[in-house]
Interface confidence: medium
Amino acid sequence: IPVIEPSVPELVVKPGATVTLRCVGNGSVEWDGPPSPHWTLYSDGSSSILSTNNATFQNTGTYRCTEPGDPLGGSAAIHLYVKDPARPWNVLAQEVVVFEDQDALLPCLLTDPVLEAGVSLVRVRGRPLMRHTNYSFSPWHGFTIHRAKFIQSQDYQCSALMGGRKVMSISIRLKVQKVIPGPPALTLVPAELVRIRGEAAQIVCSASSVDVNFDVFLQHNNTKLAIPQQSDFHNNRYQKVLTLNLDQVDFQHAGNYSCVASNVQGKHSTSMFFRVVESAYLNLSSEQNLIQEVTVGEGLNLKVMVEAYPGLQGFNWTYLGPFSDHQPEPKLANATTKDTYRHTFTLSLPRLKPSEAGRYSFLARNPGGWRALTFELTLRYPPEVSVIWTFINGSGTLLCAASGYPQPNVTWLQCSGHTDRCDEAQVLQVWDDPYPEVLSQEPFHKVTVQSLLTVETLEHNQTYECRAHNSVGSGSWAFIPISAGAHTHPPDEFLFTP
C-alpha cells in the first residue's frame, strides 16, 4: 500500500500557502483528486509529488494515491482543507443526475472543518427542503440525499454559518430521473370493432409511462393518422390518448389499426381489426355434429356459436318433439361471450330420459333477422329381448323380438340342459340371423326387429336362447321347453329400468 507524506488524514492550510503531498510506493504511483488549478506534478520512479505554491479554496478535496501495479489495488488518501474565510464551499459539480431511489451526492466540499456544526442544505432562494427529504453531510464529500425521488429534482445550495450569518455555495442542479421499466404501457380499445356502413365508430389508443418523454401514434394499415393527442397525469403516470372518431364509417375505414408507443427503452405496439359491413349479420354454427347419438341416462351439452352484429335482441332453446311438449329448463341453458361479436350458447341435458330424444332448436334474433340451428338427438338403448313359441304355417317356431338402438343383431343358441344363459361348454348349435325382420323403425325411437327360428321338435332337456346385441350392450332370453309346455326365462340381469 502506498504511503502519503505528510502522514495525516487531513491537512488544513490557508489560501496562498504552499502545499506538498508526496506519495511513495513499491512501484510507480498515481495521484487522483478533484480537478483544481495550480498543482504541479513531479514523478520519480516509485514516488510522486503533488505541489502548489498558491493554494486556493478550489484545491479543497480528497487526494488519493494508488499503485496501478498492486494486485490488491491498495490506496492511501489525504483530505486537504484550504480554509478561505470568504469561500466556505468548493463545489465540484453544478449538475448531478441520478435515477430514482439512488443516493444523490451534491459535491459541495467544506473548506474549513470547523464550520461543520453549522452546515445545512437548502433549495435556491432560501426555500426549505421538501418534506421527507432524508439527507446526510460529510465534510469531505458534501451532502447526500438518500433514495432521491423524482419530485426532488430541484436547484440546491449548501449553507454554512460564518460569524453568525449564512453563506451559500453556488447552486447545484439535481436531476432525478424516473427509472423507466420498459416501453410505455398501451391500450387500444376496442380489441375488435364491427360497424355497418354509415354508423359511427370510435377507436381509442392510449399510452402511459412514469416518464413524460415518450411518443404515441395510431396507424391505419401502416399509415400514421394525424390525430392530436390529449395528455394527462394521474396515479404518478403520464398518459397520452389518441381518439379516432368516425361519424359515418365506410369501407375504406376498415382494416388493421395499430397503437404504437416508444421511449428510450424501446417500442410497444398493439393492434385491432375494424370490419365495415354492408348490413346486419347473424351467423349460427356448431363445432358439433347436428345429428347426435347418446346412450340413455348419459348427459349431453349442445353448443351453438353465434356471430352477430348488431347484438342479439333475443334467443332461446326450443324442444320440437316428438315425445312431449316439455321445453328445456332455462337453468340448463347458459351463454358465454368470447368477445363483443361472438358468443357461445350451451344447453345442458343431464341424465337423458327416453322422452327427451328429438329435435332441439336454438333460435336467435337481431336486426338482421331470425336464424335457427336444429340438433337431432337420438338415444341409444341396449337391446331388450323376448321369445315366444308359436306355430307358423303349421310349423313350430320360436319367435324372438329385440328392440334397441342402434338396430340389434340377433343370434340363436341351442345348448344342453336347462339354463338361464348358454355358456360355451353347453352350446350345441349357433345360428346368426343376418337379416332379422324390422318391425318398427321410427325416428328417435328404438328399432324393433323379429327373428324366427323354426324348430320341428323341441328337445325337452335343452335350452334355446335368443341373444341380441348392438354398440350399447346386449340382451338375451332363454326359452326352456318343458313337458307341460314351453317355459320362458328372461335372465335376471336384464330387468332393465331406464
Epitope: A200, H220, T223, K224, L225, A226, I227, P228, Q230, L244, N245, L246, D247, Q248, H253
Partner: antibody, heavy 116, light 107 residues
Framework: QVQLQESGPGLVKPSETLSLTCTVS????????WSWIRQPPGKGLEWIGY???????NYNPSLKSRFTLSIDTSKNQFSLRLSSVTAADTAVYYC??????????WGQGTLVTVSS | DIQMTQSPSSLSASVGDRVTITCRAS??????LDWYQQKPGKAPKRLIY???SLQSGVPSRFSGSGSGTEFTLTINSLQPEDFATYYC?????????FGQGTRLEIK
C-alpha cells in the same frame, strides 16, 4: 359528409380584434379536431392551431400568441380570435377538420383584409 | 418545428410533360407527408397521403414517393387542369407545417 363554412368581417382596422366563426354541418363537432389555416395573398399556407370539443387547444408556436380558439358544441361552431391585428394578418382564413389526417375537410375560405 | 423545403418554387411545363416536385424535411418524418393541389380562389385539395398513397378520386397520373427526409410528387402526362400550386405538408409532429409551394405554369 362534413361541410364547413367560415363567417366573419371582410375588413378589420389595424389594432382591432378579428373574430371568425366556422359552422360545421353533416357531422358532430364532438368527433373531430378543428383547425384554422391562413394564406396571405400570393403566399403559402400556415397552420394556426386546432381545438377539440373538450376545449383542448394546440397553437403553432411560430405564430405570436395573439390567437385564441374556442368551441361551442351546442351550436356546432368553433371560432378564432386574433387580437391587435396588423396588415401582415391580411389573408384568406380557412377552417378545416382533422378526422384521420390533416386536413380531411376544408371550408371555402374567407378573405380578411386589415386596413384603416 | 420541422421545416419543409419545396423545390422548385415555380416550374413551366407543357401539356403531356412529366414533372417532378421535391420536398425536403429538416428532420426524419417517416412517411407522414401529404401533397396538396390548390387552384386560385379555392381551398387546397389532397392528392397523396402518407407519402405515396393516392387519394380516392385523384387521377392515377399523380404519384408520390419517398420517406424520411426526401419526398417527390410526380405528374405523368400533364393535363390542362393540372396547372396549379402544389404544397407538401408534414404531420409527423406538431406544429403541422407546409412547404412554401411550387407554382406549375403553362409554358
Amino acid at each position: 359528409q362534413v361541410q364547413l363554412q367560415e363567417s366573419g368581417p371582410g375588413l378589420v382596422k389595424p389594432s382591432e380584434t378579428l373574430s371568425l366563426t366556422c359552422t360545421v354541418s353533416g357531422g358532430s363537432i364532438s368527433s373531430y379536431y378543428w383547425s384554422w389555416i391562413r394564406q396571405p395573398p400570393g403566399k403559402g399556407l400556415e397552420w394556426i392551431g386546432y381545438i377539440y370539443y373538450s376545449g383542448n387547444t394546440n397553437y403553432n408556436p411560430s405564430l405570436k400568441s395573439r390567437f385564441t380558439l374556442s368551441i361551442d358544441t351546442s351550436k356546432n361552431q368553433f371560432s378564432l380570435r386574433l387580437s391587435s391585428v396588423t396588415a401582415a394578418d391580411t389573408a384568406v382564413y380557412y377552417c378545416a377538420c382533422i378526422a384521420t389526417r390533416p386536413f380531411d375537410y376544408w371550408g371555402q375560405g374567407t378573405l380578411v383584409t386589415v386596413s384603416s | 418545428d420541422i421545416q419543409m423545403t419545396q423545390s422548385p418554387s415555380s416550374l413551366s411545363a407543357s401539356v403531356g410533360d412529366r414533372v417532378t416536385i421535391t420536398c425536403r424535411a429538416s428532420q426524419g418524418i417517416r412517411n407522414d407527408l401529404d401533397w396538396y393541389q390548390q387552384k386560385p380562389g379555392k381551398a387546397p385539395k389532397r392528392l397523396i397521403y402518407a407519402a405515396s398513397s393516392l387519394q380516392s378520386g385523384v387521377p392515377s397520373r399523380f404519384s408520390g414517393s419517398g420517406s424520411g427526409t426526401e419526398f417527390t410528387l410526380t405528374i405523368n402526362s400533364l393535363q390542362p387542369e393540372d396547372f396549379a400550386t402544389y404544397y407538401c405538408l408534414q404531420y409527423n409532429s406538431y406544429p403541422i407545417t407546409f412547404g412554401q409551394g411550387t407554382r406549375l405554369e403553362i409554358k
